[in-house]
Every structure is written in C-alpha cells, then in structure tokens.
Amino acid sequence: QSPIFGPQDVSSIEGNSVSITCYYPDTSVNRHTRKYWCRQGANGYCATLISSNGYLSKEYSGRASLINFPENSTFVINIAHLTQEDTGSYKCGLGTTNRGLFFDVSLEVSQVPEFPNDTHVYTKDIGRTVTIECRFKEGNAHSKKSLCKKRGEACEVVIDSTEYVDPSYKDRAILFMKGTSRDIFYVNISHLIPSDAGLYVCQAGEGPSADKNNADLQVLEPEPELLYKDLRSSVTFECDLGREVANDAKYLCRKNKETCDVIINTLGKRDPAFEGRILLTPRDDNGRFSVLITGLRKEDAGHYQCGAHSSGLPQEGWPVQAWQLFVNEESTIPNSRSVVKGVTGGSVAIVCPYNPKESSSLKYWCHWEADENGRCPVLVGTQALVQEGYEGRLALFDQPGSGAYTVILNQLTTQDSGFYWCLTDGDSRWRTTIELQVAEATKKPDLEVTPQNATAVIGETFTISCHYPCKFYSQEKYWCKWSNDGCHILPSHDEGARQSSVSCDQSSQIVSMTLNPVKKEDEGWYWCGVKEGQVYGETTAIYVAVEERTRGSPHINPTDANARAKDAPEEEAMESSVREDENKANLDPRLFADEREIQNAGDQAQENRASGNAGSAGGQSGSSK
C-alpha cells in the first residue's frame, strides 16, 4: 500500500485541462523533498514530465505546472490543452528518483463525442439559453409541433404547440416560428441547468408522416480557472457573463459546504471578512465586472463563483463563472503590520512593501471606502498631488532599493480611522491593506513645536523649535518643508545632541530650524520628525504664515494644527535660507480597482515626472553661523 493518495482514474476531453491533486503523509522530509509526475512506459521506466526541482519536459512546455502545498501536504499537477496522446498511465510521487513513494494515475482523454448525422449538437453553458431548430415538410405546416426529451425508451413532452409546458420547464421554454417561415419552428430553453442535458426530439405531425429531428443538448458546467497566488498578495476575478445579464445585479460568492456565500454584490452586500480589502468594479455596459481582493489570507483559498441575478444571490439556472484559488504560504511578500494605531493629534508612519525589482515604479496610497462596491481613491503618490483635506499632513517617502516606501499621516483625527491600501503601478500582487485605528489622545503629544503662533515677517529671522522627549534621544531629528510632492528635509540643529549621553534633561531636548531672511515663499507647512535610518517615526506639523513687515494684522492659520506648542527655552540655532521648488504632478486621484486602472494612472503620471523627490534635500541650501 502506497502512502501517497490521489485520483486513480482521470477522464476528460480534448482541449480541456486537468488538475490532479496528490496527497502525501505530513512529515518534514516529505514537505521538502522533490515532487514529480512521470509517464509509465511499456518497459517499466517512468519518464519524468515535470518536477518540483524545475524540470519541465518538452511535451509539457507551456501547458503544465506542478505546485507544492506543504501546509496541506499536497501537490497539484495542472495540465492544459489535453490531446488524445496524453492518454496513458502516470505516477505522481515523492523522492529523488522516480522509484520512491508514488501513486498510479490513469488519464484518459477522449475525443469530443460525435452523434449520428441527423443529430444536431447544442453546447451551452449553465444559465444560458439554447434555441433548438426543428425542420418540417409543408405537409405538416398545420400539424401539432412538439419537443420531447428522451428518458430511456420514452420521450417526455417538454412543450408543444397546444401551449402545454412540462412543469420543470415552466417559464423557461417557448415554442415559436419566425416571420413567414413555413418549414421550421424553434424551441427556446432558457436558464439551463445540468439536468437539462440529454437527447431531445422535435416533431411536427403525428404517425408515420411526422417530421422528426434529434437534438443533443450538452449543458456545460464552468471549468474553474485555477489561480495561484501568494499569501498577502492580491487576486482579480474578471467576470464576463454576457449581455443578457447586463442589467442584473452581479455577485462574487465563495463555495461553502452547503451554499455559495456572497462575498460582495452590486446591491451593497459585503462579507465582513473582506472589509477593507475588496473592490467590485463594473467594466462596461455588457455586464463585465471585476472583483479585486488584496491581502490574501490562507483561509481565502477555495472555490469562487461570479454570477448575475436580480437578487444579487446565486440562483440555479443563471450564468456563472468559476475559479479555484490556491494561496501559497511560501510568499515573497513580506509580512507587514495589518493594523496601525494612532491617537488624535498624533501621527503614524506606515511602511509599504513593494517588489524590490521595481524600485522605479510609481507608488500610491489610497483610502478604501465602503460604498456599495468599495472604492479606493488615491490620497498621495510619488507623482500624484495630495488629495484635498490632506494638505500639510500627508507625505510619501520613497526609499529606492529598500523594497519599501513610507507614508506619513499626521494631525490625526478619528475620521482618519479606516482601511488604506499601498500599491504601485508595477507588480499588481504587491498590494497591502492597512487598518488605521485612531483613538482619542489621553496625554500630550511627544513632539511639540514653539512658538504656537508661527507668523514670520519677510526679511527678518524666524526660528521654530521642536521639543522631543528623552526616548527619542538616540534618533535622528529633522525638519522638513511639506509640499505637494513630499516633505523635503531641511538643515536643522539639534540642541539635545550637545549634552552628555548619560543624562537627559527632559526640558531641553530641542531641534530647531531658522529661516533667515524670511521670504514670501517660505510660507507653508513644516514638519518636525524623528527617524532611525530609513525608518520614520513620530511627526508633528506647524503652519508658518509669512507677512509683510508693514502689515499689522496677524495671519490666520488654515487649521488648528499649531495650537499645541509650548514656550521654548533659549537656544543657538542653525540658519538656513530655504527655497522650495514645487514641481507638481497632475495625476487625478482615481479608483484603483485593478491592474489596468493602476497602469493608466501610472502612464498619466509618467508624462508629468516631477524633479523633486520626497525625502530629498534638493532645491534647498543651508548655511551655519
């Protein structure tokens, strides 16, 4: 008895695909050893066709794959574009040779079945409509017309011209003639179900003079498309159900034991397990739509089906499309925090991983919104203008070559709570979902700026100080000037760094920035922050208003972001003449529903490449006293 198990007999027809699962005992050795699929020859030799070591034979090139699922103790052999030559005896097995542990599998590939000359074959998918054509001679023009279904020797009437309809075809079958045609009638059967398949006979007239036609109806169940995705990556289900259901509600469901549970539909239903990581996007007016799921989990693996029905729920006899999703736990996508917590008035720094091979790709950050289908408007991107309402408090710091970029959001409010997506215009699998949870602050913020009322006068010297606690002593402190294309680091001076590293006076840890002389273009948002290398930490923001020397009225700040600062101790500061080149990219924030839409956004941004780079000091100069 072999400990390997699988299907002993697999049968299919030419042109189809098979997906053969082989089960092996759950041991560490088995999980990691070579898996193979070989064809048994007459001489007893089993010739390898594909193995987990990367070997692929010539006859399987471009049409087969072998995927190991160590967490399930299974491996799957997929073979597409079957021909009758694939019929034969095979082994699926484990081990360094093809004589190790194995299981015998018989594969039989048949021709598409042929029928007698007088039989018309109709092949339709589940849920579709078939129109059966029935020819008759002029002598039967006024005779009774009927369609019956063969059941053994009997032929049970489905519909006839006396308006009889079999109850199981009620509201699905109609018998009609077209125009002035005197030699043909038609029977439409809609909402086809698997049990409709079989041999039908249509008849005009009675007895020996009757005209009869045979029709073989094949109702095809959808072949599930096999999708292999990595843990934490994303998947897009492209659903094309045809024009006849263009106006019906659409859904994606996951097959459960008893039912197919709706994950999302166009009537606003959404499974809570997919909250924050799903989008349904209509593609066109012909009923095409796509469903994108990000942040794939192990438990997302399974059988999915999309369909259409006015109820937004699966109904027998309505068209469907099917997939089987496999989620590979050996993922190239790093594990990152799925929940980030912040407090009101504070800030968060969110690290977004991306494919390190695509460091030049455009990076984006969008806010998932729970409208009926889910949408994710872009808030910020490497070449995208920051969305209205996020000016001065949101920036994207690209760190080329590191395989990650950082998004910082400060001046947090409870309204910022929700789901956000990291995405690029490159590898679509690298989309991560983050849930931001913002709680009410219970203590004062770690970083505080003085003076609170930051109004600078043109031509004069203006200094702002940022107080930080001792816990940030060893971290790098920085000031940056926020603009639509990032927050550009400025020269600054750290007072705390002068002190002995042994003691830390909580009241005198200060990093300051001086504008000397103040210019009109210095007006805007400034951030004080801490970081360690490329790891960004806490930030706080202040708006610096600039006014003429003669003007007496104080400048009114655009937000209350400056209301938190305290008086600063005296300090010696570094002066910096700050210039800011604002090269704004004109990227409309868009709903990033799938690869194509992201690609479009990327193409648009490519035309507007900005020379400024978030996190760089380009365009600024500093001088020390």
Partner: nanobody, 126 residues
C-alpha cells in the same frame, strides 16, 4: 438543500456483483464531489470511493481495499451516481452511504461532506 437517496443494496453471495445508485435532488451545484462510504457493525465509517467533477473532467478516487473491483460513475442528466461492485467479499458487508460535497479538500475524510443519504445495506454471504 440537497437530498440523497441510495438504492440497490441487498443480500448476495461472495463473488457476485451489485450496483448501488445515489440519486440527488434539490439544489445542484456546478462542481461536485459524490462519494461512497461504508460502515460495518462496531466499526468506523470508512471511505470507499469518490467521484469529483469539474466541467467535463472526472476524477475517481478509490480505497486500496476496493481497487480493481469497484467502479464509480455518474449520469449527469439523471443527477445520479452509481457504484458498481464486482467480486464481492464477505468483508464488504456494511451499510453503504452516499455523501456529497461542493468543496472537497481530501475526498477520504467524511467530515468534508455536507450531505448524506440514509444508507443501504449490503450483505455478502460466504
């Protein structure tokens, strides 16, 4: 809900043949696994055979103890699955249950199946 009804059981001599039928009614799914399990008195329910299908592709799984003797097949138009049992042995005596599932991770595991028939008795005398 799917209802499963088994038929075809009975008393036969060792070496004889028997054909069991499992008729499904109610909600039908596009991808199915229908299997046969058996339970002898005082023993656990054991896997016999399963057929799964996807479109026009069929996969047939058998327990080692019945390989070469039992054959599973299906008639899609009749929503029926058959178990042809040849060369029956006294060890094959048991109540045979038909089971169905829409999602099967491992066809040998009874808990993977959601729908069960009432069972049909097969007795093989020596």
């Amino acid at each position: 809900e799917v209802q499963l009804v088994e038929s075809g059981g009975g008393l036969v001599q060792a070496g004889d043949s028997l054909r069991l039928s499992c008729a499904a009614s109610g909600r039908t799914f596009t991808t199915y696994g229908v299997g046969w399990f058996r339970q002898a008195p005082g023993k656990e329910r054991e896997f016999v055979t399963t057929i799964t299908w996807s479109g026009s592709t069929n996969y047939k799984y058998y327990a080692d103890s019945v390989k070469g003797r039992f054959t599973i097949s299906r008639d899609n138009a009749k929503n029926t699955v058959y178990l042809q049992m040849n060369s029956l042995k006294p060890d094959d005596t048991a109540v045979y249950y038909c089971a169905a599932s829409t999602v099967l991770t491992d066809p040998r595991v009874p808990t993977e199946y959601d729908y069960w028939g009432q069972g049909t008795q097969v007795t093989v005398s020596s």
